[in-house]
């Protein structure tokens, strides 16, 4: 593949990626009521980073969002920074990367400022990613955490149920937020990584690229028998070249939203 | 406004079968769900279950599966229920009732069609 | 299934007084999603159908008059006649609003002297 390819390819699956975490931020769906083996209630709810939503059997929904910092869990607001961070950093990819493109010129911008470019967009890229990533899985690990708790909560201590009050639990599973989030942040990591193969391309290397002058004192003269005379000079009259190893160069990293917080 | 006209009310012999109806007026038919509840006589009211005429999605009572079926036509805007296998014990006035838009309620409700099963 | 028991059966009471009924569930109707309570209030007169009163356990119906009142949470509710009027002659009924299959409670019979 050639670097213009690898580099544009980049830059479309990291964009791809960049806008997939910030669905899955906003998304409301991070954690959905269990419906197996639960009562049948004519009420599903699911919750979001931001906020927690019911919707009746009518269809009518209502969300209630989270107004408050300091009495929400430190898991959540944990997942909250590492959606946001993904995202800021997917921005400052993205505009790092639309000038890194080879295609795109810009005054007088060489292909070693290029190259650079193209390595930190694409360095911006997998750390947007991978900070989605964590993010979804940390907030998956405490829906299965907290699931458990309450499966424990709705089968113990039941044995002499004989006229006390049941209260079923609301168990929580994965919404599909958290789906969207893993497949975001995947593809911001890899247009990440397609970007950084692009910017190996787009470097001169120096153990192959630089011409060597050597440069005599004086002029060498070989005098044989035959009065002929040699001369060598190489070196001022040859060309740098840039060799293009058609490296595919990673396009912008998918940057990941961040999820929306779901009570659990 | 909103009006729920049922069908009249119907005699049949234990074993038959019997098809009421609640022709709907007044609101968007496909847009509410439409429930049906039993009221025998002298008791309280036994709740049978819903379609939502939209997609024509059902729930039922477990009670009463394999006894009531849901169906609607929606080009009249018209709920129906089919019960089979009758016996005594069906005998009773069955009403339908639109689901409300809060709070899970039944917000308007038919006159009832009173069923009677006798030999 | 989810049983409503409703208290008392019947009641007897001259126009004007407070009249207050009960209902319990055996399960609790209260959503921690939204804090709703998902228990329905229905007044039935003789020889007509049901007609909504309250839901979401306090929510007034459009049109019900303000004298009726519907508190309680969790399992345990109540409604409330502030000042019985003849009109209010009926039976009222609960109704579990929360889990399928719905189900309603015996009813209460309110009787005018």
């Known amino acids: 593949m050639s670097v213009t390819a690898c580099q544009g390819l980049g830059f479309v699956v990291s964009l791809i990626g960049f806008a997939g975490i910030i669905a899955a931020t906003c998304m409301d769906q991070w954690s959905t009521q269990d419906l197996y083996n639960n009562p049948v209630t004519a009420v599903f709810n699911y919750q979001g980073l931001w906020r927690s939503c019911v919707r009746e059997s009518s269809g009518f929904t209502e969300c209630r969002g989270y107004f408050t910092l300091l009495g929400l869990p430190a898991m959540l607001q944990a997942v909250r920074a590492l959606m946001i961070v993904g995202i800021v950093l997917g921005v400052i990819g993205i505009l790092v990367s639309i000038f890194a493109l080879k295609c795109i010129r810009i005054g007088s911008m060489d292909d070693s400022a290029k190259a650079k470019m193209t390595l930190t967009s694409g360095i911006l890229f997998i750390i947007s990613g991978i900070s989605a990533i964590i993010g979804v899985s940390v907030f998956a690990n405490m829906l299965v955490t907290n699931f458990w708790m309450s499966t424990a909560n709705m089968y113990s201590g039941m044995g002499g149920m004989g006229g006390m009050v049941q209260t079923v639990q609301t168990r929580y599973t994965f919404g599909a937020a958290l789906f969207v989030g893993w497949v975001a942040g995947g593809l911001t990591l890899i247009g990440g990584v397609m970007m950084c193969i692009a910017c190996r391309g787009l470097t001169p290397d120096d153990s192959n690229f630089k011409a060597v002058s050597y440069h005599a004192s004086g002029q060498n003269v070989a005098y044989r028998p035959g009065g002929f005379k040699a001369s060598t000079g190489f070196g001022s009259n040859t060309r740098n070249k840039k060799i293009y190893d058609g490296g595919a160069r990673t396009e912008d990293d998918e940057q990941s939203h961040p999820t929306k917080y779901d009570y659990v | 406004q909103v009006q729920l006209q049922q069908s009249g009310a119907e005699l049949v012999r234990p074993g038959a079968s019997v098809k009421m109806s609640c022709k709907a007026s007044?609101?968007?038919?496909?847009?509410?769900?439409m429930h049906w509840v039993k009221q025998a006589p002298r008791q309280g009211l036994e709740w049978i279950g819903t379609?939502?005429?939209?997609?024509?999605?059902?729930s039922y009572n477990q009670k009463f599966k394999g006894k009531a079926t849901l169906t609607v036509d929606k080009s009249s805007s018209t709920a129906y229920m089919q019960l089979s296998s009758l016996t005594s014990e069906d005998s009773a006035v069955y009403f339908c009732?639109?689901?409300?838009?809060?709070?899970?309620?039944?917000?308007?409700w038919g006159q009832g069609t009173t069923l009677t099963v006798s030999s | 299934d989810i049983q409503m028991t409703q208290s008392p059966s019947s009641l007897t009471v001259t126009a004007g007084e407070k009249v207050t009924m009960s209902c319990k569930s055996s399960q609790s109707l209260l959503n921690s999603g939204n804090q709703k309570n998902y228990l329905t209030w229905y007044q039935q007169k003789p020889g007509q159908p049901p007609k909504l009163l309250i839901y979401w356990a306090s929510t007034r119906e459009s049109g019900v008059p303000d004298r009726f009142t519907g508190s309680g949470s969790g399992t345990d509710f109540t409604l409330t006649i502030s000042s019985v009027q003849a009109e209010d002659l009926a039976v009222y009924y609960c109704q579990n609003a929360y889990y399928y299959p719905f189900t309603f409670g015996s009813g209460t019979k309110l009787e005018i002297k």
């Open positions: 007044g609101y968007t038919f496909t847009s509410y769900n």
């Open positions: 379609i939502y005429p939209g997609n024509g999605d059902t």
């Open positions: 009732a639109r689901g409300g838009y809060y709070g899970n309620s039944l917000d308007y």
